[in-house]
């Protein structure tokens, strides 16, 4: 009679994470008598996966009834597969011996490969806000996928970005992989409503890529522009001066009025109006009693936006001239206007 052969018909098996893997194995003869064992790996360090004789193997079931005398099918199923289960599995026949069974013949091995989905991409931006025209970096990370091949793309408002660097880790063979990408984005004043999207495509996703997003509203700071204007006279000796604070983001803003360098009033932006691009406008006014001043008055609107150094705009109010209804665009009233940083 021909000597027993152990047949593992599948050279490789590909299984999705969470599914059940079937590893096929048959013997060509009932002789010699003895159990079979399944191992992962070869050599002394091989790991025991299933022992027909004894042991507790909660994830393993046999395809056929191994207790039947004429059984020659030693296939097994391994449930709830994870990437850590990848490897080469050997079906090994033992000959009954005393005191121990003796290894008789091994199958050629079946390589189990596991397909695992990438985790949802997580996009993170810079720790501190940046202003328009500056370049900021965004990172995207996704983990736990297998096989290694993966595609990552970056978009800003639907437009694909090209300035990014991507690494898939580790370089060598592994049970599962991670991807890390860094994209550079140039901010514009219109980016309050913009989104940066990281898109990951993998064979396990069946053409439906995963996306991670970051809102540029978390990243951008649009500094305000200031305009100080003198409004028409309300009463004989009162002048209304307004400070228009335009196109700023985020909303956090504090405004201080100074009369000849002395603090007159401080207020926090509350009832702002929102522009289409997501930036805000706000207006503050100051009623100046001209009769209380003998000399010309320098009015300064000083704005501290989002914890940044203050910016200011000044306006010279002439008290020598008789107050009359006029705007701020007359030469006399605008001569002292300037913009400076207060530190």
């Amino acid at each position: 009679e021909e000597e027993l052969q152990v047949i593992q018909p599948d050279k490789s098996v590909l299984v999705a994470a969470g599914e059940t893997a079937t590893l096929r194995c048959t013997a060509t003869s009932l002789i010699p008598v003895g159990p079979i064992q399944w191992f992962r790996g070869a050599g002394p360090g091989r790991e025991l996966i299933y022992n027909q004789k004894e042991g507790h193997f909660p994830r393993v079931t046999t395809v056929s009834d191994l207790t039947k005398r004429n059984n020659m099918d030693f296939s097994i199923r391994i449930g709830n597969i994870t990437p850590a289960d990848a490897g080469t599995y050997y079906c090994v026949k033992f000959r009954k011996g005393s005191p121990d069974d003796v290894e008789f013949k091994s199958g050629a091995g079946t390589e189990l490969s596991v397909r695992a989905k990438p985790s949802a991409p997580v996009v993170s931006g810079p720790a501190a806000r940046a202003t328009p025209q500056h370049t900021v970096s965004f990172t995207c990370e996704s983990h736990g996928f297998s096989p290694r091949d993966i595609t990552l793309k970056w978009f800003k408002n639907g437009n694909e970005l090209s300035d990014f660097q991507t690494n898939v880790d580790p370089v060598g063979e592994s049970v599962s992989y991670s991807i890390h990408s860094t994209a550079k984005v140039v901010l514009t004043r219109e980016d309050v409503h913009s989104q940066v999207i990281c898109e990951v495509a993998h064979v396990t996703l069946q053409g439906d890529p995963l996306r991670g997003t970051a809102n540029l509203s978390e990243t951008i700071r649009v500094p305000p522009t200031l305009e100080v204007t003198q409004q028409p006279v309300r009463a004989e000796n009162q002048v209304n001066v307004t400070c228009q604070v335009r196109k700023f983001y985020p909303q956090r803003l504090q405004l201080t009025w100074l009369e000849n360098g002395n603090v007159s009033r401080t207020e926090t932006a509350s009832t702002v109006t929102e522009n289409k691009d997501g930036t805000y406008n706000w207006m503050s006014w100051l009623l100046v009693n001209v009769s209380a001043h003998r000399d010309d008055v320098k009015l300064t609107c000083q704005v501290e936006h989002d914890g940044q150094p203050a910016v200011s705009k000044s306006h010279d109010l002439k008290v020598s001239a008789h107050p009359k209804e006029q705007g701020s665009n007359t030469a006399a009233e605008n001569t002292g206007s300037n913009e400076r940083n207060i530190y």
Epitope: F39, G41, A42, P44, G45, R46, E47, I49, G87, G172
Partner: antibody
């Protein structure tokens, strides 16, 4: 959590015997090969012996015929019987779990064996 | 028996710098080479196996590479906890599982 705890080390004279134990927990002991590795004071690592899941034993030439590795699966314990000890056997003895890739992924803290007259 | 030769014996590096050291096998081991880290008074810790596969929980700053029988371990940016002795080990399918003599990475 995988844990390996060695015991049985101590001071012996040349020619004497010692039996080291390694108690394993946190993994299915019966499913993995286990090994002994030693480190002489101020020296590098030296593989000593390994026992496979089926009980097959392997030894370094330097200990062959003097040391015996064994396992008690019911107690999840690995042993190393050391006979005919020599001064050059003085070392910290580590036990380690062996992966199917034949690398040692978890190690005990070691037990010191000193052979001196 | 496969002999593994590590070089240099000692490497002096400043924190934040890149550290690279090698292990040469006396005969072919394929990609079956592992790296371990050992700190004073501690047991060794598996870092890398199969020449370039990081073990579970090992940071990405550790990477391995192979060129024939020459293997390299690189630590991209040394952290204070990385100052230790590093050993290579061949893990072909059959014993003896030999180790290299070790490379000590010390603070410059």
């Amino acid at each position: 959590d995988v844990q390996l705890v060695e015991s049985g080390g101590g001071l012996v004279r040349p020619g004497e015997s010692l039996r080291l134990s390694c108690a394993a927990s946190g993994f299915t002991f019966t499913n993995y090969a286990v090994t002994w590795v030693r480190q002489a004071p101020g020296e590098g690592l030296e593989w000593v012996s390994l026992i496979s899941v089926t009980g097959t034993t392997y030894y370094a030439d330097s200990v062959k015929g003097r040391f015996t590795i064994s396992r008690d699966n019911s107690k999840s314990t690995l042993y190393l019987q050391m006979n005919g000890l020599r001064a050059e056997d003085t070392a910290v003895y580590y036990c380690a779990k062996v992966t199917w890739k034949n690398v040692f992924d978890y190690w005990g803290l070691g037990t010191l064996v000193t052979v001196s007259s | 028996e496969i002999v593994l030769t590590q070089s240099p014996g000692t490497l002096s590096v400043s924190p934040g710098e890149r550290a690279t050291f090698s292990c040469r096998a006396s005969q072919t081991v394929g990609s079956k080479l592992a790296w371990y880290q050992q700190k004073p008074g501690q047991a060794p810790r598996l870092l890398i196996y199969d020449a370039n596969t990081r073990a579970t929980g090992i940071p990405a700053r550790f990477s391995g590479s192979r060129s024939g029988t020459e293997f390299t371990l690189t630590i991209s940016s040394l952290q204070s906890e990385d100052f230790a002795v590093y050993y290579c080990q061949q893990h072909t399918d059959w014993p003896p599982y030999t180790f290299g003599g070790g490379t000590k990475v010390e603070i410059k």
